[in-house]
Interface confidence: low
């Protein structure tokens, strides 16, 4: 799933200021193609630990075998542990299950740094609070891996949520939730709203826990505020988008958008960092130090090596510029705007000796496959997955960080015109070339 | 670090009323869950109501509903539970938690990372 493991470092931490609101309604009619409203029964459903992903409880097999699994965008397989290892508390046991069945096929996945291999075969898959339904599902049992699970972060498997085309060994091995949406009445819908701890923690294990929110079929209102706002997934591979213009602090990178797509933008719950293509990150770094040069910053802390940090308390949010993402709207030469904070791009780092002080990572970083909305965009939106109507939805998480002077914002529409210039076209040859 | 104080305990007559306070302080930009709990002597910590800030949505416990309200005052970053029809099973020491977690288990201990010193709450009859 793209190059190099995409697993999140950390989540973040999440939240929305104490204040006196009126409740929201959260009983509206239906509304096709994905029930809205409230999903009591599906909230707060993500788990996770500082850094470590977010997963949901899963069930597989005859009885049910409980297992927490990593929700990812960015790939298609679901694909568990089956077999002991180190890192894993409880893997999956086929043989223990009356429903499994073998589809004598081997799948291989390499990583730049990493792999995993296993056994394909298929069997019942429940989401406990989820939708009360079982599907026959695939399933890549694990039998070999390296550098793919991480000690102690409470997840056995990954579920790719994206679409066949990016599924191995090939297109024909149907994800998750193609078959959920084939076998049940699951509108083709699902919503992500991924928070942090809520705090600056760094006391414990416990403290650092994460969670979100995975609405599978719908939406659900309370868990954003303000309008959602769609942009097309250009196609259906990853979850691709079409990025048409960034502002640091409102002022425009102006470069040429294809710059900003290139090779393409994606939506992936599974990578921690804002990841830009190389001319595009340089160019934000540079207008990143400018606004923030009141403080200096050493280069290994643009290159998200080193860390910065302050007493505690102090961290000088302000100085920081806020960032602008225009995405190509459904109205021919309209788009619009997501805007994230510098809560959402320092990520704060947990593990450090001087526990008196808040120290923090810069969350966005180059890439050579194009741009990556990870976590540091997805905290600070609701996002719905609309594949019914083949689009992306995009609102202010109600959970995320923020302080007393700014907040993330989701604006429009804007007048942007050729937008359809702003998508790279990639070569039809090297795509089977890719290295996940 | 969240600080997180409580007042208003104190004991009362059977049918009567109490008005608990917590007041929050510290670093509250980020709380979004804020819930009252309550451990009666030889008995474990139970949930009793909790509120939602960014929608205002509130949830009670069963033994509680209709009886007590839980409510916030931004401006003095302050949580409310308004007891009213107290009856001598509510005496307890209640205690004021704030969170990061979401709805489901608004009133579970379990993910709480900020807890008042409590505040003793008496019934009689």
């Known amino acids: 799933t793209q190059h190099g493991i995409r697993l999140p470092l950390r989540s973040g931490l999440g939240g929305a200021p104490l204040g006196l609101r009126l409740p929201r309604e959260t009983d509206e009619e239906p509304e096709e193609p994905g029930r809205r409203g409230s999903f009591v029964e599906m909230v707060d459903n993500l788990r996770g630990k500082s850094g470590q992903g977010y997963y949901v409880e899963m069930t597989v097999g005859s009885p049910p075998q409980t297992l927490n699994i990593l929700v990812d965008t960015g790939s298609s397989n679901f694909a568990v542990g089956a077999a002991p290892h180190p890192f894993l508390h409880r893997y999956y046991q086929r043989q223990l299950s009356s429903t499994y069945r073998d589809l004598r096929k081997g799948v291989y996945v390499p990583y730049t740094q990493g792999k995993w291999e296993g056994e394909l075969g298929t069997d019942l898959v429940s989401i406990p609070h989820g939708p009360n339904v079982t599907v026959r599902a695939n399933i890549a049992a694990i039998t070999e891996s390296d550098k793919f699970f991480i000690n102690g972060s409470n997840w056995e498997g990954i579920l790719g949520l994206a679409y066949a085309e990016i599924a191995r060994p090939d297109d024909s091995l149907e994800p998750f939730f193609d078959s959920l949406v084939k076998q049940t009445h699951v509108p083709n819908l699902f919503s992500l709203q991924l928070c942090g701890a809520g705090f600056p923690l760094n006391q414990s294990e416990v403290l650092a826990s994460v969670g979100g929110s995975m609405i599978i079929g719908g939406i659900d209102h309370s868990l954003y505020t303000g309008s959602l706002w769609y942009t097309p997934i250009r196609r259906e591979w990853y979850y691709e988008v079409i990025i048409v213009r960034v502002e640091i602090n409102g002022q425009d990178l102006k470069m040429d958008c294809k710059e900003y797509n290139y090779d393409k933008s994606i939506v992936d719950s599974g990578t921690t960092n804002l990841r830009l293509p190389k001319k595009v990150f340089e160019a934000a770094v540079k207008s990143i130090k400018a606004a923030s040069s009141t403080e200096k910053f050493p280069d290994g802390f643009w290159l998200g090596e080193q860390l910065v940090c302050w007493q505690a308390g102090t961290t000088p949010w302000n100085i920081f510029p806020v960032i602008s993402l225009y995405l190509m709207g459904e109205v021919t030469n309209q788009s619009f705007r997501i805007t994230i904070l510098p809560q959402q791009y320092l990520r704060p780092v947990e593990d450090v000796a001087t526990s008196q002080d808040d120290c923090y990572k810069f969350a966005i970083s180059q890439s050579s496959t194009g741009t990556v909305m990870g976590a540091v965009i997805m905290e600070g939106f609701y996002v719905v997955f609309d594949r019914a109507r083949k689009r992306i939805g995009f609102a202010v998480s109600a959970c995320h960080v923020h302080d007393e002077f700014r907040t993330a914002a989701v604006e429009g529409p804007f007048v942007t015109l050729d937008m359809e210039d702003c998508g790279y076209n990639i070569p039809q040859t090297d795509e089977s070339t890719l290295m996940t | 670090d969240v600080q997180l104080q409580e007042s208003g305990g104190g004991s009362v007559q059977a049918g009567g009323s109490l008005r608990l306070s917590c007041a929050v302080s510290?670093?509250?930009?980020?709380?979004?869950?804020m819930a009252w709990f309550r451990q009666a002597p030889g008995k474990e910590r139970e949930g009793v109501a909790g509120?939602?800030?960014?929608?205002?949505?509130?949830y009670y416990a069963d033994s509680v509903k209709g009886r007590f309200t839980i409510s916030q005052d931004n401006a003095k970053n302050t949580v409310y539970l308004q007891m009213n029809s107290l009856a001598p099973e509510d005496t307890a020491i209640y205690y004021c938690a704030a969170r990061g977690g979401l709805l489901s288990r608004v009133l579970k201990e379990a993910g709480y990372n900020a807890w008042g010193q409590g505040t003793q709450v008496t019934v009689s009859s």
């Open positions: 509120i939602y800030s960014p929608g205002g949505t509130t």
């Open positions: 510290g670093y509250t930009y980020n709380i979004y869950t």
